[in-house]
Interface confidence: low
């Protein structure tokens, strides 16, 4: 049988599904692929024609606690001579991820899923030129 | 370090079952932000290291649709619109957290999963290895 997409109310529920209180979901926090390695090309943030820096945002009540954000170093792009060429633009590339937020309510802890937008790096683009009439 | 409970008067309950599960509010904060990169910007076409976006769909995952970037060229596009092989287009990868239905097909039971996605491409100077 075809499984309907997330958000469809007619999602067929197998008998093995755990009972869940209304308005909440059961989340197993044993993370699948917890220890996988990111194998990005070396130092691409410095070697890129649209280089970027990383900053770490930190929140002990968020999982993961550390979220790394990239910021483009220049408005333009770096040309073959190593100079900034402002006829081109460095722009951020963004990706959504889920985080879990922990909330302290008295002696209990509650959890809320949150979508956050992470700037992953930068790319060099030809600018869009708006012609004024 | 000292164990810091939720607040000083709270019991320090160490009765932890494994694997541990938590109940999470169904309403995802910022749920309705735009998730289609084709609609959100045309950088994938205008970049000197352009990429194609491939739709990866999995109903057992939330979000069910993830867009994967694949660089179009080995080199980068120069000012003349040609591919310059003195430079390299490389993918920018990011680890993201998604929810995986567990047990499968269950509407409100999930497990966190870390996945690696290619978000876009950037143009880099190659690392040249000189042969002795």
């Amino acid at each position: 049988r075809k499984i309907p997409k997330v958000g469809h109310t007619f999602f067929q529920k197998p008998e093995s599904c755990p009972p869940v209180p209304g308005g909440s979901m059961k989340l197993d926090i044993g993370i699948i692929n917890e220890n996988q390695r990111v194998s990005m090309s070396r130092n691409i943030e410095s070697r890129s024609t649209s280089p970027w820096n990383y900053t770490v945002t930190w929140d002990p009540n968020r999982y993961p606690s550390e979220v790394v954000q990239a910021q483009c170093r220049n408005l333009g792009c770096i040309n073959a001579q190593g100079k900034e060429d402002i006829s081109m633009n460095s722009v951020p590339i963004q990706q959504e991820t889920l985080v879990v937020r922990r909330k302290h309510q008295g002696c209990s802890v509650s959890f809320q899923l949150e979508k956050v937008l992470v700037t992953v790096g930068c790319t060099c683009v030809t600018p869009v030129i708006h012609h004024v009439q | 370090g000292i164990t810091i409970p939720r607040n000083p008067g709270c019991p320090n309950s160490e009765d932890k079952n494994f694997p541990r599960t938590v109940m999470v509010n169904l309403n995802i904060h910022n749920r309705n932000t735009n998730t289609n990169p084709k609609r959100s910007s045309d950088y994938y076409n205008r970049s000197t290291s352009p990429w194609n976006l491939h739709r990866n769909e999995d109903p057992e995952r939330y979000p069910s649709v993830i867009w994967e970037a694949k660089c179009r060229h080995l080199g980068c596009i120069n000012a003349d619109g040609n591919v310059d092989y003195h430079m390299n287009s490389v993918p920018i990868q990011q680890e993201i957290l998604v929810l995986r239905r567990e047990p499968p097909h269950c509407p409100n039971s999930f497990r966190l999963e870390k996945i690696l996605v290619s978000v876009g491409c950037t143009c880099v100077t190659p690392i040249v290895h000189h042969v002795a």
Partner: antibody, heavy 126, light 107 residues
Framework: EVQLVQSGAEVKKPGESLKISCKAS????????ISWVRQAPGQGLEWMGG????????NYAQKFQGRVTITADESTTTAYMELSGLTSDDTAVYYC???????????????????WGQGTPVTVSS | DVVMTQSPDFQSVTPKEKVTITCRAS??????LHWYQQKPDQSPKLLIK???QSISGVPSRFSGSGSGTDFTLTINGLEAEDAGTYYC?????????FGQGTKLDIK
């Protein structure tokens, strides 16, 4: 992979001070606790104290109070243990050990030691 | 301070045997009891946390049980590589305290 790398072996004279470092990599240094545990030759394990970088506070065993100082430098992800007024009884292998945090139950550190440094042998002799 | 007492101090066992090491706390420590293995000239290694919780990468022959004041570490089907000293550790109150250790020798 999480690694704790400690500074090298030390030879000290009685009355001198000792400072050992423990460099952490492969984990979120700030949210974990780092404890120091020592082991005298042929003896068992003895906890000296620990620090949770995010809280910035250290706790010490009564036996070492006033003689030990544990600090952490977040910028270099390094913890330090300083022991003053050394005597021959302080001859031991000194270990740093990581205390993981427990985000899901609301705790910053949970006190069991999941990763250990390789140990720093210290000899105190005149 | 919470005093942790292990028994036996020393045990000589043949491979494939079942080994039991006990640890007694001088007061109720709930389930905040952890077990470590230490081989000669090596750092201790976490085997079991919170009395009975297994640790990723640790062979399934190691198991733990108990709560309150009495705890047990069991090795089902001892292997030659299990030789070393085993320590229990309580973390319910500061200071952390360890048992005196149980040296396990393989015949």
């Amino acid at each position: 992979e999480v690694q704790l790398v400690q500074s090298g072996a030390e030879v000290k004279k009685p009355g001198e001070s000792l400072k050992i470092s423990c460099k952490a990599s492969g984990g979120s240094f700030r949210s974990y606790g780092i404890s120091w545990v020592r082991q005298a030759p042929g003896q068992g394990l003895e906890w000296m104290g620990g620090i949770t970088p995010i809280l910035g506070t250290a706790n010490y065993a009564q036996k070492f109070q006033g003689r030990v100082t544990i600090t952490a430098d977040e910028s270099t992800t390094t913890a330090y243990m300083e022991l003053s007024g050394l005597t021959s009884d302080d001859t031991a292998v000194y270990y740093c050990a990581r205390e993981p945090n427990d985000f899901w139950n609301g705790y910053y550190t949970t006190h069991h030691f999941d990763y250990w440094g390789q140990g720093t042998p210290v000899t105190v002799s005149s | 301070d919470v005093v942790m007492t292990q028994s036996p101090d020393f045990q000589s066992v043949t491979p494939k045997e079942k080994v039991t090491i006990t640890c007694r706390a001088s007061q109720n420590i709930g389930s905040a009891l952890h077990w470590y293995q230490q081989k000669p000239d090596q750092s201790p290694k976490l085997l079991i946390k919170y009395a009975s919780q297994s640790i990723s990468g640790v062979p399934s022959r190691f198991s733990g049980s108990g709560s309150g004041t009495d705890f047990t570490l069991t090795i089902n089907g001892l292997e030659a590589e299990d030789a070393g000293t085993y320590y229990c550790h309580q973390s319910t109150s500061l200071p952390h305290t360890f048992g005196q250790g149980t040296k396990l020798d393989i015949k």
